[in-house]
């Protein structure tokens, strides 16, 4: 249940897909991975605001419980509906690989 | 991948399963559910420092942007990694249904 | 824009060695790999074999392994490839391209380079 | 190796004509595969990669499809600039392999 897609906070405020671009250093990844040197990471950044993207009825009742009790229960928050793959080239003990990660990447975003 | 399950925020601090108490009044669902009047709602509360139940590469990502981009990228999220099932008992058009919902109650909980 | 830019043509007895280099530009040459891919006479496209510039990583296709050398020169932002011992099947364009990116795209060319094996 | 079968090895067309190009590998390859158009004399260029992604600039009659090991590129109306040779590219895994190639010919 993919609910409103109409931010009331304004245009690109709530929870929506982002790409930040993060070399290998940034990530941790220098000593493992060979290419690409930098990624172009889509990641799911903003606010989630009454029944904006709501997930499912858990992220319905997290509404309702985080508008009656704000310091017990939190908003739900903006994370990854699904993944899009992505492909690494890597050092391994035989030598270099073509790796693919599924869970790497985000593809579209919800709140949860 | 789980990552770590030691919280260094100290005991209680970091992403687990909560329990609150909520009405029908409370989620908005006294028109149409007629039982339970009260719910003994599961959800996923708490920080998510570096690693902390890390549910997959992109969570890991998302600590490594953090750190160095944290007005940018958000920490990681304390989400349901899946759910209980719950069943309602509600008004219909024709009387009163014994109705299951599967994503309603968190089971246990990751970060994201 | 990027760019990859390839030596000229060259004759080559049979026997000789050919260097082809590909120069890069309007991107970072560190941040992704180089292919070079071979394409005999009216034949299909043949992979030879990739190189990290950042490293000097390489993975050659096991027909080539032991007569073709991949190097690149990051002063430069040039890729090189050497073949050695050749002969006339290797009569072929040469190219370079960038790739894979993180979606195994291949997806920069250069503009080939003739090397014609004949005695 | 992965072995990348490509049919039609060739086809006739006209002007308007919808075609579509399979590719076959020989073993899973996610979707991982590339489609390239090379006209004589010319590098080849990329049209599809990650299966279905359209590359920047290339018209949008041009789509992919498949996972795993079937693929197809489909020029949904065929124009004079699309006669040419196309082929597929898997890059799931090194050695990087191509399919033999479809030439799109004037009917």
């Known amino acids: 249940a993919r609910n409103g897609d109409h931010c009331p906070l304004g245009p690109g405020r709530c929870c929506r897909l982002h790409t930040v671009r993060a070399s290998l250093e940034d990530l941790g990844w220098a000593d493992w991975v060979l290419s690409p040197r930098e990624v172009q990471v889509t990641m799911c950044i903003g606010a989630c605001p009454s029944q904006f993207r709501a997930a499912n009825m858990h992220a319905q009742i997290k509404t309702s419980l985080h508008r009656l009790k704000p310091d017990t229960v939190p908003a739900p928050c903006c994370v990854p509906a699904s993944y899009n793959p992505m492909v690494l080239i890597q050092k391994t003990d035989t030598g270099v690989s073509l790796q693919t990660y599924d869970d790497l990447l985000a593809k579209d975003c919800h709140c949860i | 991948a789980r990552n770590g399950d030691h919280c260094p925020l100290g005991p209680g601090r970091c992403c687990r399963l909560h329990t609150v108490r909520a009405s029908l009044e409370d989620l908005g669902w006294a028109d149409w559910v007629l039982s339970p009047r009260e719910v003994q709602v599961t959800m996923c509360i708490g920080a998510c420092p570096s690693q902390f139940r890390a549910a997959n590469m992109h969570a890991q990502i998302k600590t490594s942007l953090h750190r160095l981009k944290p007005d940018t990228v958000p920490a990681p999220c304390c989400v349901p990694a899946s759910y209980n099932p719950m069943v309602l008992i509600q008004k219909t058009d024709t009387g009163v249904s014994l109705q299951t919902y599967d994503d309603l109650l968190a089971k246990d909980c990751h970060c994201i | 824009q990027v760019q990859l830019v390839q030596s000229g043509a060259e004759v080559k007895k049979p026997g000789a060695s050919v260097k082809v280099s590909c120069k890069a530009s309007g991107y970072t040459f560190t941040d992704e790999g180089i292919n070079w891919v071979r394409q005999a006479p009216g034949q299909g496209l043949e992979w030879m074999g990739w190189?990290?510039?950042?490293?000097?990583?390489?993975v050659y296709a096991q027909k080539l392994q032991g007569r073709v050398t991949m190097t690149t020169d990051t002063s430069t932002s040039t890729a090189y490839m050497e073949l050695r011992s050749l002969r006339s099947d290797d009569t072929a364009v040469y190219y370079c391209?960038?790739?894979?990116?993180?979606?195994?795209?291949?997806?920069?060319w250069g503009q080939g380079t003739m090397v014609t094996v004949s005695s | 190796d992965i072995q990348m079968t490509q049919s039609p090895s060739s086809v006739s067309a006209s002007v308007g004509d919808r075609v579509t190009i399979t590719c076959r590998a020989s073993q899973g390859i996610s979707s991982w595969l590339a489609w390239y158009q090379q006209k004589p004399g010319k590098a080849p260029k990329l049209l599809i990669y990650?299966?279905?992604s359209l590359q920047s600039g290339v018209p949008s009659r041009f789509s992919g499809s498949g996972s795993g090991t079937d693929f197809t590129l489909t020029i949904s109306s065929l124009q004079p600039e699309d006669f040419a040779t196309y082929y597929c590219?898997?890059?799931?895994?090194?050695?990087?392999?191509f399919g033999g190639g479809t030439k799109v010919e004037i009917k």
């Open positions: 990650a299966a279905s």
């Open positions: 190189i990290t510039a950042y490293s000097g990583d390489t």
């Open positions: 590219q898997q890059a799931n895994s090194f050695p990087i392999t």
């Open positions: 391209a960038r790739g894979p990116g993180q979606y195994a795209d291949v997806d920069v």
